[in-house]
C-alpha cells in the first residue's frame, strides 16, 4: 500500500492558505481539478473546477477559491479566513469522476490555532504560499533548500514561499500516480 508523507503548515485563525499545485502534463490540462480533505479515511471533495478548465476562471465555493491555469499546468487554491475546524489533511487531485481521483501531490497537514489578539500571527493579511510539485513515490521528496517540516506562519504583510520538493518529476509511468476512491 502506498502512503503519502504529509507536510505540516501552521496558521492562526483568520489567515489565508494559498497552495499552488503543479500538474505539468498536458493530459491533465483539460481535466477537472479538485481540492479535497481527508475525513477519516475518506476524502471529501470541497471544490472542483469546471470542465473544460479555462485560464484564470476562478471557482469559488464558500471560503475556497480554485483557479486553474491549464495553459501553464498550475492550479491555485486559496482558503481564506481559516478556522480551527479547518485543520486536517488536504490534497490537490485530478478529478476523474465521483468515485476516483488521481492524487498528484503529497498531502498538506493544515493546523489552525486560535490567534490571541495583538500577536503577529493573527493578521488576516498574512498569506503563506505553498508550492506543490508532482510526487511519484510514497516518500516525500526532500526539499531543494533546507526547510523545516513544520512551517509556522510569518508576521503580517510578509509572504513565506515554501517549495516542496525542489525538483520537478518526470512522470513517464502513469502507474506512478496514486488512485484513491472519492466519496462526496
Amino acid at each position: 500500500t502506498t502512503e503519502l508523507t504529509e507536510e505540516k503548515y501552521e496558521y492562526k485563525e483568520g489567515q489565508t492558505l494559498e497552495v499552488k499545485c503543479d500538474y505539468a502534463l498536458e493530459k491533465y490540462a483539460n481535466s477537472r481539478k479538485a481540492w479535497q480533505k481527508m475525513e477519516g479515511k475518506m476524502p471529501k471533495i470541497l471544490a472542483k473546477t469546471e470542465r473544460p478548465s479555462e485560464n484564470s476562471h476562478p471557482v469559488q465555493v464558500g471560503r475556497i477559491t480554485l483557479e486553474d491555469y491549464p495553459d501553464h499546468g498550475l492550479l491555485q487554491v486559496q482558503m481564506t479566513n481559516l478556522q480551527v475546524e479547518d485543520s486536517g489533511l488536504y490534497q490537490c487531485v485530478i478529478y476523474q469522476h465521483p468515485k476516483e481521483s488521481h492524487v498528484l501531490f503529497n498531502p498538506i497537514c493544515l493546523v489552525v490555532t486560535k490567534g490571541s489578539s495583538g500577536t503577529p500571527g493573527s493578521s488576516e493579511n498574512s498569506t503563506q504560499n505553498v508550492y506543490r510539485t508532482p510526487s511519484t513515490t510514497a516518500k516525500a521528496l526532500g526539499p531543494r533548500y533546507t526547510s523545516p517540516r513544520t512551517v509556522t506562519q510569518a508576521p503580517p504583510e510578509s509572504t513565506v514561499v515554501v517549495s516542496t520538493p525542489g525538483s520537478e518529476i518526470n512522470l513517464t509511468n502513469v502507474t506512478d500516480i496514486i488512485r484513491v476512491p472519492v466519496f462526496n
Partner: antibody, heavy 121, light 111 residues
C-alpha cells in the same frame, strides 16, 4: 535514459525543402510536447516552434521568422518528431536541435546533439 | 513577442570570484506567481544544458555554486565561485508565452 537524435540535415539550395527527424527514446514520447531550436554559427539560440500532444490536439506554434514555411509534426507510434522546412532561405542555415520539455510550458531538460542545415547556392 | 535582454554581452571574471548575469524581459514572464524563466549553459560544439528552471530552481546534477533569482521582468544568474569549467555562453529563456524566446547570450570568460 532520455535520448533525442536528429537527422536529415544537409546542403540545400535557396527555395528548396528539407525534412528533419527527431527520434526519441527513454520516455513516453506521446506525453510531452516537442520543440525545435536552431543556432546559426557563432550566433545565439532561436526557438523555432513546438508541437503539443494528442490531448492538446497536436497544436503547433511557430516563431514569426518561420511561420508559413516550416511545419512541425509528430508520429507517436514511431516516437519521432519532424520539422518540414520549405522555401528555405540562406538565413535558415543553422544547427537544428530537437528538445523535450518537462511539461506544459516547462524548461528544456533534454536536447539532441543537433543536425546542420546549410542553405546555399 | 517577449524580448529578453541579457547584460552584459560578455564578462571576464577571476577564478574563485562571483559572476553575475542579468536578464530583463520586455514584459512579465510570471503566471500565478511562477516565473517561467530558465537559464542554460552552452559550451562550444555542444547543445545547451539546463542549469536553472523557473527562475530559481537548480536542475538536478548542477553544482550549487549556480543560483538564480528574480521575478516578473528582472532575473539574475549567479555563479558564486567561478571554476574553469564554467567558461561558456549563458542564455536565459522564457516559456510563459508563445513564441518562446531566448536572450542573446552572455559569454563568460576567465580574467
Amino acid at each position: 535514459e532520455v535520448q533525442l537524435v536528429e537527422s536529415g540535415g544537409g546542403l540545400v539550395q535557396p527555395g528548396g525543402s528539407l525534412k528533419l527527424s527527431c527520434a526519441a527514446s527513454g520516455f513516453t514520447f506521446s506525453t510531452y510536447a516537442m520543440h525545435w531550436v536552431r543556432q546559426a554559427s557563432g550566433k545565439g539560440l532561436e526557438w523555432v516552434g513546438r508541437i503539443r500532444t494528442k490531448s492538446s490536439n497536436y497544436a503547433t506554434y511557430y516563431a514569426a521568422s518561420v511561420k508559413g514555411r516550416f511545419t512541425i509534426s509528430r508520429d507517436d507510434s514511431k516516437n519521432t518528431a519532424y520539422l518540414q522546412m520549405n522555401s528555405l532561405k540562406t538565413e535558415d542555415t543553422a544547427v537544428y536541435y530537437c528538445t523535450r520539455d518537462m511539461g506544459i510550458r516547462r524548461q528544456f531538460a533534454y536536447w539532441g546533439q543537433g543536425t546542420l542545415v546549410t542553405v546555399s547556392s | 513577442d517577449i524580448v529578453l535582454t541579457q547584460s552584459p554581452d560578455s564578462l571576464a571574471v577571476s577564478l574563485g570570484e562571483r559572476a553575475t548575469i542579468n536578464c530583463r524581459a520586455s514584459e512579465s514572464v510570471d503566471t500565478a506567481d511562477y516565473s517561467f524563466l530558465h537559464w542554460y549553459q552552452q559550451k562550444p560544439g555542444q547543445p545547451p544544458k539546463l542549469l536553472i528552471y523557473r527562475a530559481s530552481n537548480l536542475e538536478s546534477g548542477v553544482p550549487d555554486r549556480f543560483s538564480g533569482s528574480g521575478s516578473g521582468t528582472d532575473f539574475t544568474l549567479t555563479i558564486s565561485s567561478l571554476q574553469a569549467e564554467d567558461v561558456a555562453v549563458y542564455y536565459c529563456q522564457q516559456s510563459n508565452e508563445d513564441p518562446y524566446t531566448f536572450g542573446q547570450g552572455t559569454k563568460l570568460e576567465i580574467k
